[in-house]
C-alpha cells in the first residue's frame, strides 16, 4: 500500500536568466527511493539513480545541473522554461511517486516563491 | 543490438529447485534494472523479481518471496532467478526483461525457457 | 493489488479498419500505464510507455491515451501484421499487474 506523501515547492517564479532550484521530498513512508526522475511535460531532464548517481539527458547538459540532494537546479533560465515539471520516485516495495511544480519565468525583477504545497 | 537469452528452464519435480540465467549482450548491462516476467500457461503475465542496475534493491511477488532470489553478475552480464519449493503454479515461460532507463516499462524481452513443476 | 480490466477480451477487424481496445484500473493510477504487443510464439514487445509515448521504431498507428482509471489503445487503420494479443500493465503499485489481454484478429 502506498502511504507517501510527496512536498514540493509548489508554484514558483524565477527571472530569465536566472536559476531555481527544484525540490520534492517523500514523507510517510518507509520506502526505499531507487530512482528519481525530472520531467518537462513529457521530456526527460535528469535521472538520480540510487546505484548509478546522476544522468543529465544530452539535450539538457548545459542548463540543467544535479542537486542539491534529489533536487535540481535550471540554469540560464528563458520565458520558453514557464511550464509543469515533474518529479517522479520510483521505490521499493511501493511503486511510482508523482509531485508536480509549475515554474513561471518572468522578464521582469518581481519573481517571489510561491508557496509549498503537497500532493498525496 | 539488445539481446537476452535465457537458460535454465526444464521439468522439475514438485518441491524441487531450478536456476534460470540470463546473457545479456548489446547494451551496458550495469546501467539497466532488470527483471523476470512468467506468463503462465493460461497466458497471465506476472512480474515475478526485479533488481536495481547495481544490485542493491531487489522487488519479488508476494507468491514468490522466500522461495526465489533474484541476483546479477554485472561483470559477467548475467540475471539470474534462484527457485526453490517449486508449486505447480510456478509453472510457466519465464521471461528476462529490461526496464527503460526512466523505469516507466519493460523495453526489451528475452525469447524466454519454460519452467514445468511436476508431481 | 490494481486490477487490470482489458476489453474485449478479443475482436475481428477487417484491414485498415480502426481497432480500440480499453484498460481499466480498479484505482487511479496516474499515467503510469504501458501497451505491449505479443505475436503468436514471441516475447511481448512494448509499444506505448506511460499511456500515451510511442516507443521507439513503433509505427505511428498505434496509439494511446487515458489517465486515472480509464485507458484507450488504437491502432488507426490494421495491418495484418498486427495480429497479435495486446497487454495492458500499470507501474504505478506494485505488483505491477498486466491486463488479462486482447486477442485481435484479420476478418
Known amino acids: 500500500m502506498m502511504t507517501g506523501t510527496i512536498e514540493t515547492t509548489g508554484n514558483i517564479s524565477a527571472e530569465k536568466g536566472g536559476s531555481i532550484i527544484l525540490q520534492c521530498h517523500l514523507s510517510s513512508t518507509t520506502a526505499q527511493v531507487t530512482q528519481v526522475n525530472w520531467e518537462q511535460q513529457d521530456q526527460l531532464l535528469a535521472i538520480c539513480n540510487a546505484d548509478l548517481g546522476w544522468h543529465i539527458s544530452p539535450s539538457f547538459k548545459d542548463r540543467v545541473a544535479p542537486g542539491p540532494g534529489l533536487g535540481l537546479t535550471l540554469q540560464s533560465l528563458t520565458v520558453n522554461d514557464t511550464g509543469e515539471y515533474f518529479c517522479i520516485y520510483h521505490t521499493y516495495p511501493d511503486g511510482t511517486y508523482t509531485g508536480r511544480i509549475f515554474l513561471e519565468v518572468l522578464e521582469s525583477s518581481v519573481a517571489e516563491h510561491g508557496a509549498r504545497f503537497q500532493i498525496p | 543490438d539488445v539481446k537476452l537469452v535465457e537458460s535454465g528452464g526444464g521439468l522439475v519435480k514438485l518441491g524441487g529447485s531450478l536456476k534460470l540465467s540470463c546473457a545479456a549482450s548489446g547494451f551496458t548491462f550495469s546501467s539497466y534494472t532488470m527483471s523476470w516476467v512468467r506468463q503462465t500457461p493460461e497466458k497471465r503475465l506476472e512480474l515475478v523479481a526485479a533488481i536495481s542496475s547495481g544490485g542493491s534493491y531487489t522487488y519479488y511477488l508476494d507468491t514468490v518471496k522466500g522461495r526465489f532470489t533474484i541476483s546479477r553478475d554485472n561483470a559477467k552480464n548475467t540475471l539470474y532467478l534462484q527457485m526453490s519449493s517449486l508449486k505447480s503454479e510456478d509453472t510457466a515461460l519465464f521471461y528476462c526483461?529490461?526496464?527503460?532507463?526512466?523505469?516507466?516499462?519493460?523495453?526489451?524481452w528475452g525469447q524466454g525457457t519454460s519452467v514445468t513443476v511436476s508431481s | 493489488d490494481i486490477q487490470m480490466t482489458q476489453s474485449p477480451s478479443s475482436l475481428s477487424a477487417s484491414v485498415g479498419d480502426r481497432v480500440t481496445i480499453t484498460c481499466k484500473a480498479s484505482q487511479n493510477i496516474n499515467v503510469w500505464l504501458n501497451w505491449y504487443q505479443q505475436k503468436p510464439g514471441k516475447a511481448p514487445k512494448l509499444l506505448i510507455y506511460?499511456?500515451?509515448n510511442l516507443q521507439t521504431g513503433v509505427p505511428s498507428r498505434f496509439s494511446g491515451s487515458g489517465s486515472g482509471t480509464d485507458f484507450t489503445f488504437t491502432i488507426s487503420s490494421l495491418q495484418p501484421e498486427d495480429i497479435a494479443t495486446y497487454y495492458c500493465?500499470?507501474?504505478?503499485?506494485?505488483?505491477?499487474?498486466f491486463g488479462q489481454g486482447t486477442k485481435v484478429e484479420i476478418k
Open positions: 500493465q500499470q507501474g504505478q503499485t506494485y505488483p505491477f499487474t
Open positions: 506511460k499511456a500515451s
Open positions: 526483461t529490461r526496464w527503460l532507463l526512466s523505469l516507466y516499462a519493460m523495453d526489451y
